[in-house]
Interface confidence: low
C-alpha cells in the first residue's frame, strides 16, 4: 500500500496482435490499441501506416477500411499516435495473424496427442497455430 504506480505515456505494448478469419470485412473491428494517457489531458489522434486498409478511431479501435483477404502483405503495419498540441508522436506495430482453418485445427489437435509419444517429430507444429473455439 502507498505505492505510486509509474505511468509512462505512450503505448504500453511494443506489438499488438490479433487473430482473424481470412476474409476481413469493411468496417470490421480488428483490435484495440490502448494508449496510456497519463495526465488525461492529452488530445491524441491516431493514424495508420496503411490508411487504405486500416483506420483507427479516437478510442484506439482499429477497423478495416475495406474488404480483403488477410495475407502476408496486410500482416504487419504501424499505428501512430500524435499529441494534437505538442505534436509529440508515438508508434506501435500491429501484427495480424490468420485464424487456423478447421483442417489446421485438427492437425494441431492430433499433433498435440502425438507429441506425448513423439515430442521431437511433431514439435514443428507447436506454438504456430492458435486454436480458436468456434
Amino acid at each position: 500500500s502507498g505505492e505510486i504506480a509509474l505511468c509512462k505515456t505512450g503505448f504500453p505494448e511494443d506489438v499488438y496482435s490479433a487473430v482473424l478469419s481470412k476474409d476481413v470485412h469493411e468496417g470490421q473491428p480488428l483490435l484495440n490499441v490502448k494508449f496510456s494517457n497519463c495526465n488525461g489531458k492529452r488530445k491524441v489522434q491516431y493514424e495508420s501506416s496503411e490508411p487504405a486498409d486500416f483506420k483507427v478511431d479516437e478510442d484506439g479501435m482499429v477497423y478495416a477500411v475495406r474488404s480483403f483477404p488477410l495475407s502476408s502483405e496486410h500482416a504487419k503495419f504501424l499505428i501512430y499516435a500524435q499529441d494534437k498540441e505538442t505534436q509529440e508522436k508515438w508508434q506501435v506495430a500491429v501484427k495480424l495473424s490468420l485464424k487456423p482453418t478447421l483442417t489446421e485445427e485438427s492437425v494441431k489437435e492430433s499433433a498435440e496427442v502425438e507429441e506425448i509419444v513423439f515430442p521431437r517429430q511433431f514439435s514443428k507444429h507447436s506454438g504456430h497455430l492458435q486454436r480458436q473455439k468456434r
Epitope: S21, K22, D23, H25, E26, M61, S67, P69
Partner: antibody, heavy 115, light 106 residues
Amino acid sequence: EVQLVESGAEVKKPGASVKVSCKASGYTFTSYLMHWVRQAPGQGLEWMGYINPYIDVTKYNEKFKGRVTMTRDTSTSTVYMELSSLRSEDTAVYYCAGGDYEDYWGQGTLVTVSS
Amino acid sequence: EIVLTQSPSSLSASVGDRVTITCRASSSVNYMYWYQQKPGKAPKLLIYYTSNLAPGVPSRFSGSGSGTDFTLTISSLQPEDFATYYCQQFSSPPFTFGQGTKLEIK
C-alpha cells in the same frame, strides 16, 4: 449452441413497412457481422446488406438503398431489418445470417405483401 | 456488381454419381462460399474460403477454383444431397449469389 431466431410471419399492404427481428444467442453478439438475405417464392437468394453490431455500421445493397434500414440492440443481442414502401415483389422469406463464416442462419420470416 | 453464373441450372443424377457444379464470376473474386438449400429450409453452409469444409459437412463435398472459376464437387451422391446449391462471393459488396443449381434424382 448458436441460434438465430427470427420474428414471425407478416402480411403487409403495398406502401407499408415491415420490421423483422433476429435474436442471436450462443456467441458474442458483437463479434460478427449480421447479414440479411431474402428469397422470393421459387427464386434464388438475394443479399440485402449487413450490420456490424460492434460499431453499428451498415452496408446495403444499392438495390435496397433508401428503403432498407438495419439496426441493432446490443442489450438484447437482436438485429432488426426494416423495409419500407413495400411492393408485391418484396414478398419473400427474409433470413438473417451471421457467424464466423456466415454459417449460422435464422429460420426465415415470410413477409407477404398483398392488397 | 459481381455477377455469379452457375452451371448447370439444373441437373439430374443418381445416387453414387460424381457431380460437379461450376460458378463463374463476372470479375475476379478472392474466395467462394457454397450453400445447400432444401425446400422450406434455410441455406446451410457447405464450403467457405473456396475449399474449406464447414463443420459437420461430409467429406464427399469439396470445393476448388480461383479467380473467376470455382467448382463444387460431390464425389458420391447420397439421397440427402438432392437439393439446390448456391455459390456466394464475399470479395466485393454487394455480396452476390449465383442463381442456384437444382440437383434432382434421376
